[in-house]
Structures are given as structure tokens and as C-alpha cells.
Interface confidence: low
Amino acid sequence: GSQHIRAEKAMVDGSWLDLAKRSKLEAQPFAHLTINATDIPSGSHKVSLSSWYHDRGWAKISNMTFSNGKLIVNQDGFYYLYANICFRHHETSGDLATEYLQLMVYVTKTSIKIPSSHTLMKGGSTKYWSGNSEFHFYSINVGGFFKLRSGEEISIEVSNPSLLDPDQDATYFGAFKVRDID
Amino acid sequence: GSQHIRAEKAMVDGSWLDLAKRSKLEAQPFAHLTINATDIPSGSHKVSLSSWYHDRGWAKISNMTFSNGKLIVNQDGFYYLYANICFRHHETSGDLATEYLQLMVYVTKTSIKIPSSHTLMKGGSTKYWSGNSEFHFYSINVGGFFKLRSGEEISIEVSNPSLLDPDQDATYFGAFKVRDID
Amino acid sequence: GSQHIRAEKAMVDGSWLDLAKRSKLEAQPFAHLTINATDIPSGSHKVSLSSWYHDRGWAKISNMTFSNGKLIVNQDGFYYLYANICFRHHETSGDLATEYLQLMVYVTKTSIKIPSSHTLMKGGSTKYWSGNSEFHFYSINVGGFFKLRSGEEISIEVSNPSLLDPDQDATYFGAFKVRDID
């Protein structure tokens, strides 16, 4: 009898471990979205970037949703959010409208349940990109730990979108869930 | 009989918790590697940095391997990768070869099974470090979430390696596993 | 008998899962602290920033302590630490004391058991903020993975504190526990 119970216990515990492992995987949303260079807005004004890849190269998504340029949270939790934005200009692209630039990124959260939009993180720099140099480059990185609720949307706004570096290793943003909300 | 079963269950569950805790720890690779200043290449060209500490000061590694300047993945998973690279120059070090600099970092992944090397993340800035100032400094930070397979190698390339800040708090890179691959 | 044991096992396993889930939540400390703009030191020298919010807007803390400008570790573990620091100046604020600036952040760890203070991470840039531009901005981001012991304190030092951007999305630092120490 005792042996039978041990065997049954091991079997049931094994299935619990499988179940726990499976549910743990399902319960850990993440996304890494890379810029879609075919649809970068022009101009120097601040815009929301709506074209990102979610399923090619380094880009991937799981248990989150990407729609209309927004990363939508499907599961409440605490997430680490990050963004890397690269700007560049080569003299062969023509003259800059101004040599004094404000190169900025804003990571925003929109709540559709309680209509509101807020900036979670910002970064950037004012730059003087003079005509004395043929090539200019600048990158921004931001990251932070935030409580996100199901249905909330994360989006990226930048200034001077026409200067964005279109490489997947240059301009991207992402999130991964670290823990549940108590 | 029932009491005996309860006692045995508590004991076995206890050992399962120990085992689960131990396996969880073993299953979470990480590394934080700091620059080895005794062997920084000279020059201004782009080079792969091969000398890093893994076991002194803030540097540490667990369930990953460091070999020939590469951080080797031992366990499939999704990892958060990061790098912080600082460049500096003081006039006492002599004149710069050029005042127009491209200070860059590239975090690359090499797959030895299918020989290929790809840039996962890049960052940096073009800088004008004029002789009007006695000291110049600039830091780059990049980070992102990537799927890594056992045997893949992470390495760091920089431009202008001779300008690297050799402090362990300045120039480092690292990784930690966040979750398994489904 | 066997049916009774199965029922009891399911019940006990259920409570184990609850307990495991609860203890997992309790075992994951985190903090995201945002600058308290009412008490930013003046001047251009390097100072320790002691005023941070921990319970309003994006700021939050759990299983860590904030006291006297320090983030205190309550639980041994490996943590990912990060900081985002923004500096800005508008000509309406008056002239800068100097146009050549060193804008820096230092993330330091103090151990009160063995009195010592060490810089874990640093970042920043020298900047030339000329009077030709009415507005200047610059952000720094640093992040890294560190072993922290209960009682150790994390603090933030910056140069030129009077230039700090007081927005919660601009100037903040934080930490979250990734794993236990073996």
C-alpha cells in the first residue's frame, strides 16, 4: 500500500511539475519589436512610431499583442520595459533642416479603460550636427520597471523620425514580465 | 495509516521544494563581465574586445562560459543582454588623432553550428572632442531581450578602443536568463 | 482509501501551490524611485541625491526599504539595477556658470556591515552647451546585474544637480530581484 502511494505521488508530482513549468512559460509575456523601415514618418516633429516588426529577425512576441503601433498588455504584472533608438544622418542624404536638433524618445502608456496617456520614460539629447562632419550618429537607451494592467498599451514617440536608423539592431523596444502583482 | 501518509507526504513535498529550488537556481544562468584594462587594443578602428574579467570585483558568471573573449551560452533560453561602454580622453594623454570621433558599441551573436555573426544591438554617438576642453567623456548603454541557444557566443565590438574607460563600473556587459523557450 | 488519499493530495497540493505562489511574490523585491523635485541640491559639484518618491506616480517599492536617500536591500539576491538621469537647461533659467559641463551619474553600493562605498555603474558625457541654442537636454541610462546582500544600500550621485530634469519619466532609478544567491 505504502509503495503504491509513493509511486502514485511521484507520478502526480511529475505531472504537477510539468503543469507548473508549462503554466510558468505561458505566464511570462515578452516582446522585442524592431523598427519597420518601410514606413518611417518623415519630418522633424514628434510622432508616434506605428510600424514595428514582431516576427522577423530579432523581433518576437509572446502573450502580448502588437496592434497599430502599440504593444498591448494581455496580462497584469510588473514588467521591465526598454527602448533603444538610434538617429543618423549622412551628408549624401542632403542638408539637415537645422543643425540644432532635439533627438528624443518617449515611452508612453495608454489606458483604454480609463482614457489617459502618460509618459513612463524619456531620454535623448540636444545635438549640434554641423556640416563640418559628413556623418552623424546618436543613440538613446531607456529602461525601467513598471506595473502594467491588461489592456494598457505601450507606444514609442520620437522627434525627428526621418533621422531614425532603420536597422533592427539600432531601433527597437521591448518588455518582459518579471513578476505578478500581489 | 492516514497519519503516516500525511507525514510521508510532508517529507516528500519538502524534498521536492528543495529540489525545485535547487533546480531553479541551476537553471538561471547569468554573467556580468568587466573590462580587463591590461589588454585593451590600441587604435581607432573597430575591434572585438577579448579581455574581460569574470571573477573579480563586480564580475561574475554562473551557468555560462567565458572563453576567448566570448560569453558562451550553455542553456537555451530568453536572456536580457546589456552593455555599458565608457570612453574618455584627457589632454595629458596626448592629442587625439582626430577631433571628430565615432564612438560605438556593437553586441554581436555568433553561432558556431551555422557559422554566422550578427549584431543584436548597437549604440553610440559621433562626437566632436575639441582641444578647447581638457577632458572628454561619453558613455553608451544598450539592452535587449533575445532568444539564445546553447553554443551561441556573445561578444562586444567597439570603435576607438584606445579611448575606453578601464574602470569596472564603466565598461562592462552582461546577461541573465529570464525564461525558458517554449 | 486510495480515493481519500487522492482527494487529500489534491487538496494539499493546491495549498502548496498557493503557498509557493505567495512565497514567490514575497521573494521578489523591487523598487522604482522617481526624483523628488522639491529638494534637488543646487550647484555643479557632485552630490548624492537623497530625495526620491517611492509611492506616487510611477514610483513603487516592495520588500526593499527607502531611507535617507538610500535604497536598502532587505533580501540577499542577484538584482538588476538601473538608472535614468536627465539634465536640461533653458536660457530663461539664466546663463550657465560654464558652457563646458560634465554630466555624470554614479550608482553606488554602501555596505554598513563593512563600512565601504563602491561605484557599481557610471555613465555620462562631457557636453558643450553653448549660448547659441536656447534649450539643452541630455539623458544617461545605466543598468547592470549585481549581487546584493541584506543591509546594503544603493544610492545615486550626480554632477550638476541643479540641471536635473524633475519629471518622474526623466530622472529615476530602480532595482528588481532576478534570482537567489546559491
Partner: antibody
Framework: SVEESGGRLVTPGTPLTLTCTVS????????MSWVRQAPGKGLEWIGY??????PYYANWAKGRFTISKSSSTTVDLKITSPTTEDTAAYFC???????????WGPGTLVTVSL | DMTQTPASVEVAVGGTVTIKCQAS??????LAWYQQKPGQSPKLLIY???ILASGVPSRFKGSGSGTQFTLTISGVQCDDAATYYC????????????FGGGTEVVVK
């Protein structure tokens, strides 16, 4: 691309399910909205759904419509108890947020009549 | 909810037409504009209040934020004859319709 199907003539009170089939993008990563347009009238947003999330409905649509994801490439709109006022062309479109509804289907016509 | 004016407007070829859309509460820049021709499905023109969708001619311009938005078509062409709709993409909570009532543009 997006294509709607299932539109037909039904009598009042007979439940009807419309299907939206997508190709070229993944439903697991996109919001899908349903919009309708009565003959000679303007566009009316019914609601949307995203993978893993609950559907959202306009106030007037709550209880009258059910949006669900029926497979990895299809989203359904069920008209629970049609009335003559539900006669309209029904469109399925990708998206909702600040970037708008950027891919539309050609629509499917539903006629509710005795 | 969205209030769109005017309901109909006549414009000569080469002229300029302005369509206004008012939100009942602030929606930031979360507004899109669509063009619909008879028998066709709507086509996205502008999103995020002012960003031109891919392939849309530059004579279409969106502006505004908060509660007041404008679509301006300058140098109107015969092909621009259609009904135009605004749509808020800000809130799905407690709304009757995300779309404005529409504006019919008749080109003479």
C-alpha cells in the same frame, strides 16, 4: 488581407455569426475591430478583440453582439438576436488605437427581414 | 463621442475643404481620418491626428489634438469626392460610437 463572410438574409431573432478571416498577418498579435454601416448611413464601431484579451464593445452593442476569436486566422461576430435595425454591411478591420483601422475587408451584407 | 462638421460640403476642383471633428473629451492625438467611396470599404488616410498613411497624397493634412481636430484637403481633385470620417482611437470604455457622423465632399 481581411475578408468577411456569413452575411445573408435572416428573420428577426435568428442568431447569425459572421466570420472575419485574415491572412498576411497574425491574429495572435493584432487587434481586430468590427464596424457596420446601415444603407445610406455612417460608420458605427461595434467593438474589438485582441489575442488573450476580452472583447470591448460600444455601449449600444453590449449584449447584442459577441466578438470571439474562433481560430488562429478567424474572428467571429455573433448577432445574438437580430432586428431589422441590424440590416447593414459589416466590416472587419485590423486595429483600433491611435494608428487607426489600417486594413479593411470588403464587407459582408446582413439583411434582417420578416 | 465624435461630432463631425459639416455634414456635407461642395468644393470646386483646385479648391480647399476643411472638415472638423470634435471629441466629447480629450483624446490626445489618438484620431484617425478615413475616406469612403460608394460601394467601397473605408480607407485610412491619417492616423495619430497628423500622420499620413502610406500612399496618401500630401494634399491631405490632419491637425489638432485634445478635443479639436481638422482634416484639410488642398488642391482638391475630382477623385477626392467621397465621404470622410474621423475616428477616435483613445477609449473603448463607455462610448456610443468611435466614428464621427461623416462629411460628404462633393467636387464640382
Amino acid at each position: 488581407s481581411v475578408e468577411e463572410s456569413g452575411g445573408r438574409l435572416v428573420t428577426p431573432g435568428t442568431p447569425l455569426t459572421l466570420t472575419c478571416t485574415v491572412s498576411g498577418f497574425s491574429l495572435s498579435n493584432d487587434v481586430m475591430s468590427w464596424v457596420r454601416q446601415a444603407p445610406g448611413k455612417g460608420l458605427e464601431w461595434i467593438g474589438y478583440i485582441w489575442s488573450g484579451g476580452s472583447p470591448y464593445y460600444a455601449n449600444w452593442a453590449k449584449g447584442r453582439f459577441t466578438i470571439s476569436k474562433s481560430s488562429s486566422t478567424t474572428v467571429d461576430l455573433k448577432i445574438t438576436s437580430p432586428t431589422t435595425e441590424d440590416t447593414a454591411a459589416y466590416f472587419c478591420a485590423r486595429g483600433f488605437g491611435s494608428s487607426g483601422l489600417n486594413i479593411w475587408g470588403p464587407g459582408t451584407l446582413v439583411t434582417v427581414s420578416l | 463621442d465624435m461630432t463631425q462638421t459639416p455634414a456635407s460640403v461642395e468644393v470646386a476642383v483646385g479648391g480647399t475643404v476643411t472638415i472638423k471633428c470634435q471629441a466629447s473629451q480629450s483624446i490626445g492625438s489618438n484620431l484617425a481620418w478615413y475616406q469612403q467611396k460608394p460601394g467601397q470599404s473605408p480607407k485610412l488616410l491619417i492616423y495619430s491626428a497628423s500622420i499620413l498613411a502610406s500612399g496618401v497624397p500630401s494634399r491631405f493634412k490632419g491637425s489638432g489634438s485634445g478635443t479639436q481636430f481638422t482634416l484639410t484637403i488642398s488642391g482638391v481633385q475630382c477623385d477626392d469626392a467621397a465621404t470622410y470620417y474621423c475616428q477616435q482611437g483613445y477609449s473603448v470604455g463607455n462610448i456610443d460610437n468611435a466614428f464621427g457622423g461623416g462629411t460628404e465632399v462633393v467636387v464640382k
